[in-house]
């Protein structure tokens, strides 16, 4: 999960494995102030998961979320 510092969520580790696409309802990018660029996926249970924006599955999920 992203770590909040002064209300700016940042990620210090990424999930390596793909999450089920059907479990993800939205996403957001962390702030440019964070040391690690990250995508945060929000699951249908409102859990937040940090992911590496360079990973293929992450890019694929972002594209499909943008289209839906």
């Amino acid at each position: 999960s992203p770590y909040s510092s002064d209300t700016t969520p940042c990620c210090f580790a990424y999930i390596a494995r793909p999450l089920p696409r059907a479990h993800i309802k939205e996403y957001f990018y962390t702030s440019g102030k964070c040391s690690n660029p990250a995508v945060v996926f929000v699951t249908r249970k409102n859990r937040q998961v940090c992911a590496n924006p360079e990973k293929k599955w992450v890019r694929e999920y972002i594209n499909s979320l943008e289209m839906s």
């Epitope: 580790a13 999930i15 390596a16 494995r17 793909p18 999450l19 089920p20 696409r21 059907a22 479990h23 699951t43 249908r44 249970k45 859990r47 998961v49 990973k55 293929k56 599955w57 694929e60 999920y61 499909s64």
Partner: antibody
């Protein structure tokens, strides 16, 4: 060192159920995603389903939906896979395998449990 | 659902290079993992994310992924490399892990 140790071989009659266990040592079960994969004699690997800790949910391969149940007992760090309404085509070696936080991919695997379905 | 196609068998002489292919529609858009399975044993991950090796896997094992084909390359093949090899991808359309049919590598 992470290790997975599975329960012993089973012989079942058609229509019965089987429950295979997978005991984890070297880490706590809820740190990792646990998956189940089977391999029929002389055939390839077939993914059956797995637990997604990030969402606290289990996903099943469509082929096994309604016939398989995967559970975890975190107090004993043991995962279970139960397959019901067995038929002869379910004769296979059943493996548990973890999907760690890093690197991606299934590793390590249990030693496998042979399930034979025969009348 | 997503289909991965592997040749059933590949034969190679010791010291030579074995190339095992895994075909799938636009597979380059997916991360491919490769497993080695020796007779009577559980599979072992040898390559993940197309081309990365887990610790303990020899540098002789390498992977690539382009277009509709991913490839596992075993250079300077040894007798101990004789095994079945499986490719695997995550299919986000079905939320399923998918395995190829496997390739038996025989060292002549």
């Amino acid at each position: 060192q992470v290790q997975l140790v599975q329960s012993g071989a089973e012989v079942k009659k058609p229509g019965a159920s089987v429950k295979v266990s997978c005991k984890v040592s070297g880490y706590t079960l809820n740190d990792f995603a646990m998956h189940w994969v089977r391999q029929a004699p002389g055939k390839g690997l077939e993914w059956m389903g797995g637990y997604v800790p990030e969402d606290g949910d289990t996903i099943y391969a469509q082929k096994f939906q309604g016939r398989v149940t995967m559970t975890e007992d975190t107090s004993t760090d043991t995962a279970y896979m139960e397959l019901s309404s067995l038929r002869s085509e379910d004769t296979a070696v059943y493996y548990c395998a973890t999907d760690p936080l890093y690197p991606p991919g299934l590793q390590p695997w249990g030693q496998g449990t042979t399930v034979t379905v025969s009348s | 659902s997503y289909v991965l196609t592997q040749p059933p068998s590949v034969s190679v002489a010791p010291g030579q290079t074995a190339r095992i292919t895994c075909g799938g529609n636009n597979i380059e858009s997916k991360s491919v993992h490769w497993y080695q399975q020796k007779p009577g044993q559980a599979p072992v991950l040898v390559v993940y994310d197309d081309s990365d090796r887990p610790s303990g896997i020899p540098e002789r094992f390498s992977g690539s992924n382009s277009g509709n084909t991913a490839t596992l390359t075993i250079s300077r093949v040894e007798a101990g490399d004789e095994a079945d090899y499986y490719c695997q991808v995550w299919d986000s359309n079905t939320d399923h892990w998918v395995f190829g049919g496997g390739t038996k590598v025989t060292v002549l």
